[in-house]
Amino acid sequence: NKILVKQSPMLVAYDNAVNLSCKYSYNLFSREFRASLHKGLDSAVEVCVVYGNYSQQLQVYSKTGFNCDGKLGNESVTFYLQNLYVNQTDIYFCKIEVMYPPPYLDNEKSNGTIIHVKGKHLCPSPLFPGPSKP
């Protein structure tokens, strides 16, 4: 059995920020799970991770320098991405793993969401250099 994931086909980030909602065919209430958002056709960049646990607050983090937050619904996780750069326009995929109680469940690969970053051109940090000028 696989969890099905629904995402908007496309979102436009006008102010370098966007809410991406991942809707699951599974109720996450009282489960322990790991929801994540991945960038690129190959899902190579793990943008944001949300850990859900029966007893603790949501743990939300990014190991790849994205400014993200997460919100949990019964059958959804919403990722709030801020300070996006125009060159981070890409396709983003929701993933979910439900670990406890057994059995382990994960999702069928979703169709993804194209996030088109149209916001103001933020001054990129050295970690995210913009295109070089001649």
Epitope: E97, Y100, P102
Partner: antibody, heavy 118, light 111 residues
Framework: EVQLVESGGGLVQPGGSLRLSCAAS?????????WSWIRQAPGKGLEWIGE???????YYSPSLKSRVTISRDNSKNTLYLQLNSLRAEDTAVYYC???????????WGQGTLVTVSS | DIQLTQSPSSLSASVGDRVTITCRAS??????????LHWYQQKPGKAPKLLIY???TLQSGVPSRFSGSGSGTDFTLTISSLQPEDFATYYC?????????FGQGTKVEIK
């Protein structure tokens, strides 16, 4: 038949680190099951350390989370346990084990003894 | 964390005796009718061996004199007729949620 063989145990200084290996044969560690590390202090009970899923996701015991890393090398079909800032209380036999569909541990390695002492 | 309390901590019995070990969880380990409670046997210097999973299902290759029962918070491991090779320490384990926890063990000794 699934076989798990741990190695890397021995005498470690307090404050040091250990890196244990668990070589699996007869089953691919990236297949549908998940893999745990469990330890047993001399004369004591069993303590779960953490686990790695076939996806690569990891879960750790809250009491050890800040000091432990579980990883794997798919090409070698081997799991690893890294434990830092070792104390005398970390002296134990360390086992790797496979979790079945109910998360019972159906296959275990023979264990490797780690002694933390100066 | 879910605490598992086994009783007794140790017992002395003779070959042929019926032995019962109990495991009580600090909260229910049931989910959709399945009890995520398992039993192991461990002999000195050896790794634990899975006997019973999901409270009552006998692991392949384990003799039928071992049986498990219970649900919710109260579970029992029974050895119907103790054999010489059964003298060992027995542990229960829950996998309902993290951290996975074990009982403190019950040592079965020869009377």
């Amino acid at each position: 038949e699934v076989q798990l063989v741990e190695s890397g145990g021995g005498l470690v200084q307090p404050g040091g680190s250990l890196r244990l290996s668990c070589a699996a044969s007869g089953y691919s560690i990236t297949s549908g099951h998940h893999w745990s590390w469990i330890r047993q202090a001399p004369g004591k009970g069993l303590e779960w350390i953490g686990e790695i899923y076939h996806s690569g996701s990891t879960y750790y015991s809250p009491s050890l989370k800040s000091r432990v890393t579980i990883s794997r090398d798919n090409s070698k079909n081997t799991l690893y346990l890294q434990l830092n800032s070792l104390r005398a209380e970390d002296t134990a036999v360390y086992y790797c084990a496979r979790k079945d569909d109910y998360y019972a541990f159906d296959y275990w390695g023979q264990g490797t003894l780690v002694t933390v002492s100066s | 964390d879910i605490q598992l309390t086994q009783s007794p901590s140790s017992l002395s019995a003779s070959v042929g005796d019926r032995v019962t070990i109990t495991c009580r969880a600090s909260e229910s380990v049931d989910f959709y009718g399945i009890s995520f409670l398992h039993w192991y046997q461990q002999k000195p210097g050896k790794a634990p061996k899975l006997l019973i999973y999901a409270a009552s299902t006998l692991q392949s290759g384990v003799p039928s004199r071992f049986s498990g029962s219970g649900s919710g918070t109260d579970f029992t491991l029974t050895i119907s007729s103790l054999q010489p090779e059964d003298f060992a320490t027995y542990y229960c384990q829950q996998s309902y949620r993290t951290p996975i926890t074990f009982g403190q063990g019950t040592k079965v000794e020869i009377k």
